[in-house]
């Protein structure tokens, strides 16, 4: 009986996410038969979260609508081994936009899910930001430094980094 | 006051070349992200080239990607394009503006009095 | 491409009458509560002029007759007392992705 109303439950939640994923990976989480973790397929997965290269050209606003429209956002990127583990799948002659903007233009930069801005925690290149018209974030490759972050103009199409949390069923 | 003057303009046969300047005063050019736009004759209005104040990031539509290049001397407050392998459909008035941020997206605020490309044989 | 679908095309309207232009994108542009659609006007000879920038603002030293209104796909240029010296060719352009693509323009007469 209670493995029935497990499985019913999860049938449910799988129905939810249907009409944005019609396919889930999921993994067993610990020693836990009942505790499962899922992403679309064919995302990735690195710690609690799900991430999608999206690799259409589009501008930065449509871009996070992109990822909106899949229970998304943009990638906000809080550690150097979370941006360790995107970067493996990142193409070097190509830029990502990150959830990562300065809507007004003084410096203030906002990550598109609230999380607060930590200079401290932040993979900018050498000289990056360095325009007041360039309001987006991409991380992108130079030969010099590797993986970084710089900013450009919002309306020009890159490609992007959608991330969601892991579905838990 | 804001000034721009286009420059460099004329006749040219197709496959030729042409580099137009824009000579800017009245702003702090070196602050500026610019652009140049065209429009032929009876069309509309085409965005062409912009480059950041910098100087490092420029941008292109497809139908002038790899023909034209945008650059910026920010010491002679000039700004450049330089057309290649011109084509008929070349042919415009072309506008040099100055481009101002709004939010995510942008204006062309201060625009100069243009200069008139013609591709004839 | 983003594509800006003006109408009318040419439009004659009485000194002191009210004038209204349309401009629909093929898509959204909208993001977070603005919408990324400008107006310019164009007079003869001359090159175009900032009016109205994300589609409701009116630019520095424009004259209040004009304004701007709409968001999504559809927007509206109102010149609500038409002037001699309004007279000119206006065009709506979408600065939310490049290419940056403007309407055909809508040219405002006396009638």
């Known amino acids: 009986n209670f493995m029935y109303s497990k499985t019913v439950k999860r049938l449910s939640k799988l129905r939810e996410y249907q009409q944005y994923h019609p396919s889930l990976t999921c993994v067993m989480e610990g020693k836990d038969i009942e505790d499962w973790s899922c992403c679309p397929t064919p995302w990735t997965s690195f710690q609690s979260s799900c991430y999608f290269i999206s690799t259409g050209m589009q501008s930065w606003t449509k871009s996070q609508k992109n990822c909106s429209v899949m229970g998304a956002d943009l990638v906000v990127i809080n550690t150097r081994e979370e941006q360790d583990f995107i970067i493996q799948n990142l193409k070097r002659n190509s830029s990502y936009f990150l959830g990562l903007s300065d809507p007004g233009g003084r410096r203030h930069w906002q990550w598109v899910d609230q999380t607060p801005y930590n200079e401290n925690v932040t993979f900018w290149h050498s000289g990056e930001p360095n325009n007041l018209d360039e309001r987006c974030a991409i991380i992108n490759f130079r030969s010099s430094e590797e993986w970084g972050w710089n900013d450009i103009h919002c309306h020009v199409p890159q490609k992007s980094i959608c991330k969601m949390k892991k579905i838990y069923i | 006051e804001v000034q721009l003057l286009e420059s460099g303009g004329g006749l040219v046969q197709p496959g030729g070349s042409l580099r137009l300047s824009c000579a800017a005063s009245?702003?702090?050019?070196?602050?500026?992200?610019m652009s140049w736009v065209r429009q032929a004759p009876g069309k509309r209005l085409e965005w062409v080239a912009t480059?950041?104040?910098?100087?490092?990031?420029?941008y292109y539509p497809d139908s002038v990607k790899g023909r034209f290049t945008i650059s910026r001397d920010n010491s002679k407050n000039t700004l450049y394009l330089q057309m290649n392998s011109l084509r008929a459909e070349d042919t415009a008035v072309y506008y040099c503006?100055?481009?101002?941020?709004?939010?995510?997206?942008?204006?062309?605020?201060?625009w100069g009095q243009g200069t008139t490309v013609t591709v004839s044989s | 491409d983003i594509v800006m679908t003006q109408s009318p095309d040419s439009l004659a309207v009485s000194l002191g009458e009210r004038a209204t232009i349309n401009c629909k994108a093929s898509?959204?542009?909208?993001?977070?509560?603005?919408?990324?659609v400008n107006w310019y006007q164009q007079k003869p000879g001359q090159p175009p002029k900032l009016l109205i920038y994300?589609?409701?603002n009116l630019e520095s030293g424009v004259p209040d007759r004009f304004s701007g209104s709409g968001s999504g796909t559809d927007f509206t240029l109102t010149i609500s007392s038409l002037q001699a010296e309004d007279v000119a060719v206006y065009y709506c352009?979408?600065?939310?992705?490049?290419?940056?693509?403007f309407g055909g323009g809508t040219k405002v007469e006396i009638k």
């Open positions: 503006a100055t481009y101002r941020p709004y939010y995510y997206g942008s204006v062309l605020d201060y």
């Open positions: 009245g702003i702090t050019f070196s602050t500026y992200t």
């Open positions: 480059i950041n104040s910098g100087g490092d990031n420029t």
């Open positions: 898509q959204s542009v909208d993001y977070d509560g603005n919408s990324y």
């Open positions: 994300g589609a409701s």
């Open positions: 352009q979408q600065s939310d992705e490049d290419p940056w693509t």
